[in-house]
Amino acid sequence: IAAHVISEASSKTTSVLQWAEKGYYTMSNNLVTLENGKQLTVKRQGLYYIYAQVTFCSNREASSQAPFIASLCLKSPGRFERILLRAANTHSSAKPCGQQSIHLGGVFELQPGASVFVNVTDPSQVSHGTGFTSFGLLKL
Amino acid sequence: IAAHVISEASSKTTSVLQWAEKGYYTMSNNLVTLENGKQLTVKRQGLYYIYAQVTFCSNREASSQAPFIASLCLKSPGRFERILLRAANTHSSAKPCGQQSIHLGGVFELQPGASVFVNVTDPSQVSHGTGFTSFGLLKL
Amino acid sequence: IAAHVISEASSKTTSVLQWAEKGYYTMSNNLVTLENGKQLTVKRQGLYYIYAQVTFCSNREASSQAPFIASLCLKSPGRFERILLRAANTHSSAKPCGQQSIHLGGVFELQPGASVFVNVTDPSQVSHGTGFTSFGLLKL
């Protein structure tokens, strides 16, 4: 069971990143699915290595003082969502913006029907060029 | 099937990074090989988690305006190479240069004879000290 | 065999990061253990994907000129410790400090009784908020 999905620019104002089965994507079988273009949902309980990479372009003067934060989050059936992993990068002083990349990854127990998704502080800063931003998992 | 190889400084002007089976490297068996010191080639079709880490040292004034970009690329038999993953980091203002590290990783389907390699915008900026720059894969 | 542990602030002056089985941690069975809150120790020989993520907050003026370095290290029975992976990030000019995240990961052969741990140049700069700093492994 494995998946690797590709970032998709979105006109939605949500902080949850959007993904698509496009380009050189992976979706090994129907035991993992991409739901609503925003979350990877698994059918089998078990340990999974889950990862995300986010490239963004921001400028210190044009952004809030808070850093750019990417969060890998879990939503299990009947439970509140929770943060599994986070990474933070202070905005660049480069103009018009400076690119930076974040990588998150870890091993987590997922229940049947559990979903994982990626949240960022400012989705408008995310880079969607080939290979820059992706999200995936593999069952151990 | 797994491999982990260590960066090697090169006098070549190519943007493809060079690697060696040295230090604490891994080469599990002959189903994965390091070819020409530049690419990991697999003999078996399947899903692989492929990763690379690149540490580099650059300075904004001494570099081009474009960021430092590391790309994980795939070359399948009879096909053009394609980009699997990329990460970008704007150059530092630190002098003489500022170190930064990039990590790339994802799950991809590889065909028999497929090769993966790492390309960077400026190989002269890559750090080759122990543990700083490495490349590997594992078959799921 | 898999583990994922969560960073723990420590009053110790050691450069070795401290970890805990808290929050959404993973400890699959007793073939991997967290020892003294500082190292993951395995009982079985084999290939392991080992990873760490460290988020830190630093300022160029308040820090030494040397970059922030995170190292993934190995201690095998009867042998000296050795560095497996390192990542380096130059300090930010943001005030009071600028956050940055480092991710390390690779495939390594571990012997029975081998331990892996994470070393940083300045543990006081490490961020311990939910999800920011973690450490884990999985047996292939």
Epitope: G129, T130 | R79, E81, R82 | -
Partner: nanobody, 123 residues
């Protein structure tokens, strides 16, 4: 929106040289193979040359081999065709074309084209 804009065409004497350029925008240039295709007056399309995404591999039609050189500058999102030892039969409209990712090298599929630039070889 994908855009390909050719330039550099013109009138040149036999044996002369020209350099065509193609400025690309609206896609990740470095990720795609690129090609030059030409159409002589009253004739069909003829593939001229293709270059791999990272520029390491190049391919040429037999009719131009040894005279034409394809190249690319991924930092400038620009494709080039250096044409030397030009002949009357090289007279054509030259099109810059983008190929999809992942196709076989010998496939001649193109998903985007420029408007073309006219090259006339005449004394």
């Amino acid at each position: 929106e994908v855009q390909l804009l050719e330039s550099g065409g013109g009138l040149v004497q036999p044996g002369g040289s020209l350099r065509l350029s193609c400025a690309a925008s609206g896609f990740t240039f470095v990720a795609y193979p690129m090609a030059w295709v030409r159409q002589a007056p009253g004739k069909g399309l003829e593939w001229v040359s293709t270059i791999a995404p990272l520029g390491g591999n190049t391919y040429y039609a037999d009719s131009v081999k040894g005279r034409f050189t394809i190249s690319r500058d991924n930092s400038k999102n620009t494709l080039y065709l250096q044409m030397n030892s030009l002949r009357a039969e090289d007279t054509a409209v030259y099109y810059c074309a983008k190929r999809p990712e992942g196709l076989q090298i010998d496939s001649q599929n193109f998903d985007y084209w420029g408007q073309g630039t006219l090259v006339t070889v005449s004394s």
